[in-house]
């Protein structure tokens, strides 16, 4: 009986035409939607002023729906038994399921600034950038809405430079109407223990945004795993969210709608700094703001975004170093708010559940030649929001799970 | 030691365009802004134009506005000026300056004259 | 533009200092020994000396003032000095009308 299921369950899950596995692969069956929490910051003329600590207090959730669109450009490679791939981004905003309106406004740094004087070092280009930004009365920090905070706005200082910049500034900016990839996984027709793990991102085997192993691609992209998981695996994934590749260790057995998941979670260790864990010193990019390399928890990206600082962390700050928080006033890390888990359903490694929690935080330093930055004392890894994209199963194909998968097996 | 070479300065008419070239030697050229600095004869000193190690920032003086180009081939380790619509108050020794990171001179070019009359 | 007097006299041996304001950042002082020479930068970036210059040139800022000081002036030290630094409301790079500095 064991060796049919087993059979059964490799062929299924194969992502090829016709199987379970590919119908639910090309178009997620399960709603799919990011919450945001925007940190509102409270005294911004103290913090430019005076050096004070940022004093910020969340406003949230703000939900979209997302993942909604089917992949594209699904290709078939016979040769090498792999499938490419593109994920269409798409995002809808749920007023029933949020606090309030895309019109909301809330006083953030200002995006434009903090990333134009970590981008030109040269003090002449600065001396011109403090001419645009005082000539655009642009300060340290901006009032914005929601929906020009994520999705762009044209900023008045940008809009300023005289030379061929994009003008248009946004946390996701652009969004609508884009796509991540192309992907090239594995189908798993040959092996099956290669399924979904993938073979290429961007046409590479590499990010080229990391030294050594860190830049490499590893795993799958979380959405599904090789059958037969087992709970001393340690699931690699990749998230081109966080522009890297990370892991997911076994927590505990969780019953879900009547289905037997194993929850994986990703641990204080991939966050850890290089002296925790030797394997993150090539996440360690430079040496001032990482204390050289002490610090932990948050994760310099902007080599992936076009030099802009971007820091990754998880929300709150949660598993990073006291000296991250320390200039942040406001935050409550806990683990079960703001830690990322997996559940997966061993048999098929399909993932039934999940709830993927990151924080985007930019930094800012004193310049010298900057009078909005001139009276900072110290450099901030600011807080602009978190979010939590979660999916579950529906009680349908939950439903068709138990009857045709765990059902059998029990 | 650090040089600064410039040339294509000479009697030039009213109206037409001038372009003077600055070649540096003795330094990693490609560190510095540029700057050309000019002295109308008996006046002091104008600030005319400067470019950023890269050539991606540019900034004129309020006198050339519109009329000035200034840039640069980090190859050749040149810098060049590029005055359109020439007057008579553009008449001067035009100096080409090395910038030192904040806008203050550390070197300077011996110069070369400009006059431009008909 | 940077404001800077237009004269100042002292005898050798004394001290001698021209002062700046009105710019925004760094402060360089540049001499010249006849109209038409090339100038010569006796300190850049405030308080900087080039390393062919001697010690008795030295420079300070404070705020928006930049101080330029000969200390022991000798009479090949005659000549016109001016400042250079960057002007906030002109927003570009400006020098003051120059300093002639005589030595009697």
């Known amino acids: 009986g064991d060796l049919l299921i087993q059979k059964t369950i490799k062929k299924q899950v194969v992502l090829e035409e016709g199987t379970i596995a590919f119908k639910n692969w090309v178009k997620t069956g399960t709603e799919v939607y990011r919450q945001f929490w925007i940190f509102d910051v409270q005294n911004p003329q103290e913090v430019m002023m005076n050096s004070s600590n940022i004093q910020v207090k969340q406003r949230g959730p703000y939900t979209y729906r997302v993942r909604f669109l089917a992949k594209e450009n699904v290709t078939q490679d016979a040769e090498d038994n792999t499938v490419s791939f593109l994920q269409p981004n798409g995002a809808i905003f749920e007023p029933s399921l949020s606090v309030g309106t895309e019109a909301d406004n809330f006083t953030v740094l200002n995006l434009a600034v903090a990333a134009a004087s970590h981008i030109y070092q040269n003090q002449f280009v600065q001396m011109i950038l403090n001419s645009l930004i005082n000539k655009s009365k642009s300060s340290m920090f901006q009032v914005r809405t929601l929906r020009e905070l994520l999705w762009g706005y044209r900023d008045p200082f940008l809009s300023l430079v005289p030379y061929p910049v994009t003008t248009t500034v946004g946390l996701f900016y652009p969004y609508n109407n884009t796509a991540d990839g192309v992907y090239k996984v594995f189908n798993g027709k040959d092996n099956i223990s290669k399924v979904a793990i993938i073979d290429t991102y961007k046409g590479k085997r590499n990010l080229s945004y990391w030294e050594s192993h860190c830049d490499m691609i590893n795993g799958t992209d979380a959405a599904s795993f090789p059958p037969f998981v087992e709970k001393s695996q340690v699931l690699q994934f990749f998230s081109s969210d966080i522009c890297r590749s990370i892991y997911a260790v076994f927590e505990s057995d969780v019953n879900l709608k009547g289905i037997p998941v194993y929850r994986f979670v990703l641990p204080s260790k991939a966050f850890a700094s290089p002296v925790e864990n030797p394997d993150n010193y090539c996440f360690c990019t430079e040496k001032i703001i990482s204390k050289n390399c002490t610090s932990y928890g948050v994760l310099d990206i902007s080599k992936c975004k076009e030099g802009r600082p971007v820091y990754i962390s998880l929300p709150h700050f949660l598993y990073a170093s006291p000296d991250v928080s320390e200039p942040i006033d406001g935050l409550n890390p806990n683990e079960e708010e703001h830690r990322t888990y997996l559940d997966i359903e061993p048999i098929t490694g399909f993932t039934l559940q999940f709830a993927k929690r990151l924080q985007v935080n930019l930094l800012v330093k004193p310049s010298e030649k900057i009078q909005v930055l001139k009276n900072l004392k110290r450099n901030y890894i600011v807080p602009i929001l978190w979010l939590n994209e979660t999916g579950t199963i529906g009680d349908e194909k939950a439903n068709m799970f138990r009857s045709q998968v765990t059902g059998k097996i029990n | 030691a650090v040089t600064l070479d410039e040339s294509g300065g000479g009697l030039q008419t009213p109206g037409r365009a001038l372009s003077l070239v600055c070649k540096a030697s003795g330094f990693t050229f490609s560190s510095y802004n540029m700057f050309w600095v000019r002295q109308a004869p008996g006046k002091g000193l104008e600030w005319v134009a400067g470019i950023d190690d890269d050539g991606s920032f540019t900034l004129y003086g309020a006198a050339v506005k519109g009329r000035a180009t200034i840039s640069r081939d980090n190859g050749q380790s040149t810098v060049r000026l590029q005055l359109n619509n020439l007057r008579a108050e553009d008449t001067g020794t035009y100096y080409c300056a090395r910038d030192s990171g904040a806008v203050s001179i550390d070197a300077w070019g011996h110069g070369t004259e400009v006059i431009v009359s008909s | 533009a940077l404001t800077q007097p237009s004269s100042v006299s002292a005898n050798p041996g004394e001290t001698v200092k021209i002062t700046c304001s009105g710019g925004d950042s760094d402060y360089g002082w540049y001499q010249q020994k006849s109209p038409g020479s090339a100038p010569v930068t006796v300190i850049?970036?405030?308080?900087k000396r080039p390393s062919d210059i001697p010690s008795r040139f030295s420079g300070s800022a404070s705020g928006s003032t930049a101080t330029f000081t000969i200390t022991g002036v000798q009479a090949e030290d005659e000549a016109v000095y001016y400042c250079g630094g960057w002007d906030g409301s002109y927003d570009g790079a400006v020098f003051g009308a120059g300093t002639t500095l005589t030595v009697l």
């Open positions: 850049y970036q405030n308080d």
